[in-house]
Amino acid sequence: GSMGHAPKVGRLIYTAGGYFRQSLSYLEAYNPSDGTWLDLADLQVPRSGLAGCVVGGLLYAVGGRNNSPDGNTDSSALDCYNPMTNQWSPCAPMSVPRNRIGVGVIDGHIYAVGGSHGCIHHNSVERYEPERDEWHLVAPMLTRRIGVGVAVLNRLLYAVGGFDGTNRLNSAECYYPERNEWRMITAMNTIRSGAGVCVLHNCIYAAGGYDGQDQLNSVERYDVETETWTFVAPMKHRRSALGITVHQGRIYVLGGYDGHTFLDSVECYDPDTDTWSEVTRMTSGRSGVGVAVTME
C-alpha cells in the first residue's frame, strides 16, 4: 500500500487483510459514490480471519492470524488506522489470540467475541476501552464460537452462528451489557459458520456462510420485535468467510470463498427492492477480510 496521505473523503468502505494463498496485509477502501478503490497503508503484519470496526473515526483491526509460508500464528493484536494520516499504530493486545473473531461496538467500546487459538475455540469475550487502551474480560458466551457473526442493535450485542469445534451452528445469543449476561435467542433457519452479520433497519441480517457441507448464498434476517428469522433474497454468489458492512441503508458483502474460488465480487443489497446487485470487484479475490465503514 502507498504511504502518502489518504484523500479526505466522506464515508468509505475499508477492507483490511484477508487470505489468498497466504494472509494479506492490504488495506483498501471503496468509495461507493464514485466506484473507486484507494490503496492505503498496509497492515504491519499480514492477517486473515480478522474483524474490522470503527470507533471515533479510527479503523481498528482485531485478531485474526498470519498464515504464511513461514508458519501460522494466531493474533491477539489490536491495531488502529488513522485515515487522516494513513498510518497504523499498535494498541494493547487482547488477553488471548482470536482467529476468525467477531467484533461489535457499543458506546465506543469494542467487544471481541469468540475466535480460536490453535485447537481452542473460545467462548470468552473481552471489551476494549480506547481512551484507556485496556482490555477487560466480560461474561463468556453460552457457546464456543469461531467464524461468528457479531452485530449491535439497540445497544445489545448479538453473536450469530459459527463453529464450536465440533459442529457448525444455527444458534444465536445476545449480550446485555448492563447485566453482563448472555441469553439465547431464536436460532436461525440455517446453520451458518463464517457468515456475514450486520444490522440494517432494526433487523439483524445473516448472509451466506458455510453449513458444514456447502457454502451458502441464502440470507435471513432477525426481527427483534417478533423474534423470528425470515429469508430475504439470496446473494448471487455462494460465499463463506465474507466481509460485510452497511453503507447508506444498503448491505455490502465483500469477497469470501465459494468452495472453489476466492471471490473478488462485491454485492449490494437494497432492502427496498429485496435485490442484490454486483457493484464492484475488489482488486483481487480473497476471503477472511475485516470490513468497516468510516463515520461521517
Epitope: 487470505y19 494463498r21 486473515s48 480471519g49 498464515n67 508458519g71 501460522n72 476468525r100 490453535g118 485447537c119 481452542i120 467464524g147 463453529f163 469445534g165 465440533t166 459442529n167 459458520s193 463464517g194 458455510y210 458444514g212 457441507q213 456447502d214 463463506s240 468467510a241 470463498y257 468452495g259 476466492f262 476471503s287 477472511g288
Partner: antibody, heavy 119, light 107 residues
Framework: EVQLVESGGGLVQPGGSLRLSCAAS????????IHWVRQAPGKGLEWVAS????????LYAKSVAGRFTISADTSKNTAYLQMNSLRAEDTAVYYC????????????WGQGTLVTVSS | DIQMTQSPSSLSASVGDRVTITCRAS??????VAWYQQKPGKAPKLLIY???SLYSGVPSRFSGSRSGTDFTLTISSLQPEDFATYYC?????????FGQGTKVEIK
C-alpha cells in the same frame, strides 16, 4: 463406506514435479478438511499440508512451503497435492487423510502412494 | 514446533499382557492428543482422540490418559492383532506433530 484412494506417485528426478490425487467416496470433501501426511521409508509420520473447506485456507509444513500446493475439486470429490522442486528427502509414502469432527485428528486415511525422488 | 517424545521406541510383550506407551509434549498441548495404530504396509488407524476418548469401533482394551504434558496409551490385554507400531499426535498448535513411534513386538 468412507474411502480415500491416492494416486499419482512414482519415480521422479530431483527438481522434478508430481501431482498426487486423493479421490474420496462415502463422504463429501466439501464437508471436511483434507490433509496430506507422509512417511519416509522406515520412519515416522510427518504432517505435510491441509485445506479448510470453509475458508479455503491452506496450511503447509515448513519443509514443503513454497514447493507444494494442496487443492480440492469438490465437483470431482478429489483433493490434490502438487509437488514441485522435489528433493531426495521428499521420498516417502504420501497419505491423504480426512479430519474428523475433532480438530486435526484423522479418522480416515487412504492406502498411500509412494513417491521416490532419485536420479 | 512442539516435540512429542514417545517411549519406549520398541517393546516386546506377550498376548494378554498390559502394555503402556507414553508420549511427552515439549510444552502444553491441553488434551489435543490422538493415538494411531499402524501395521506394516498399511495406513494408520485412529484409536484415541482428545487424549482419552475412544474412537468409534475401537476395542475397549485401548485407553488413553493425560497427566499434564504426559500422555499414555494403555492396552489392557494385548491381542495378536495388536502387534503394530503406535504413534501419538498433538494437534494443539500448528504444525501438528507426531511422536517417533513405538513398535510393539511379540516376545
Amino acid at each position: 463406506e468412507v474411502q480415500l484412494v491416492e494416486s499419482g506417485g512414482g519415480l521422479v528426478q530431483p527438481g522434478g514435479s508430481l501431482r498426487l490425487s486423493c479421490a474420496a467416496s462415502g463422504f463429501a470433501i466439501s464437508a471436511s478438511s483434507i490433509h496430506w501426511v507422509r512417511q519416509a521409508p522406515g520412519k515416522g509420520l510427518e504432517w505435510v499440508a491441509s485445506i479448510d473447506p470453509e475458508t479455503g485456507e491452506t496450511l503447509y509444513a515448513k519443509s514443503v512451503a513454497g514447493r507444494f500446493t494442496i487443492s480440492a475439486d469438490t465437483s470431482k470429490n478429489t483433493a490434490y497435492l502438487q509437488m514441485n522442486s522435489l528433493r531426495a528427502e521428499d521420498t516417502a509414502v504420501y497419505y491423504c487423510a480426512r479430519e474428523g469432527k475433532w480438530w486435526a485428528y484423522f479418522d480416515a486415511w487412504g492406502q498411500g502412494t509412494l513417491v521416490t525422488v532419485s536420479s | 514446533d512442539i516435540q512429542m517424545t514417545q517411549s519406549p521406541s520398541s517393546l516386546s510383550a506377550s498376548v494378554g499382557d498390559r502394555v503402556t506407551i507414553t508420549c511427552r509434549a515439549s510444552q502444553s498441548v491441553s488434551s489435543a492428543v490422538a493415538w494411531y495404530q499402524q501395521k506394516p504396509g498399511k495406513a494408520p488407524k485412529l484409536l484415541i482422540y482428545s487424549a482419552s476418548s475412544l474412537y468409534s469401533g475401537v476395542p475397549s482394551r485401548f485407553s488413553g490418559s493425560r497427566s499434564g504434558t504426559d500422555f499414555t496409551l494403555t492396552i489392557s490385554s494385548l491381542q495378536p492383532e495388536d502387534f503394530a507400531t503406535y504413534y501419538c499426535q498433538q494437534s494443539y498448535s500448528f504444525p501438528s506433530t507426531f511422536g517417533q513411534g513405538t513398535k510393539v513386538e511379540i516376545k
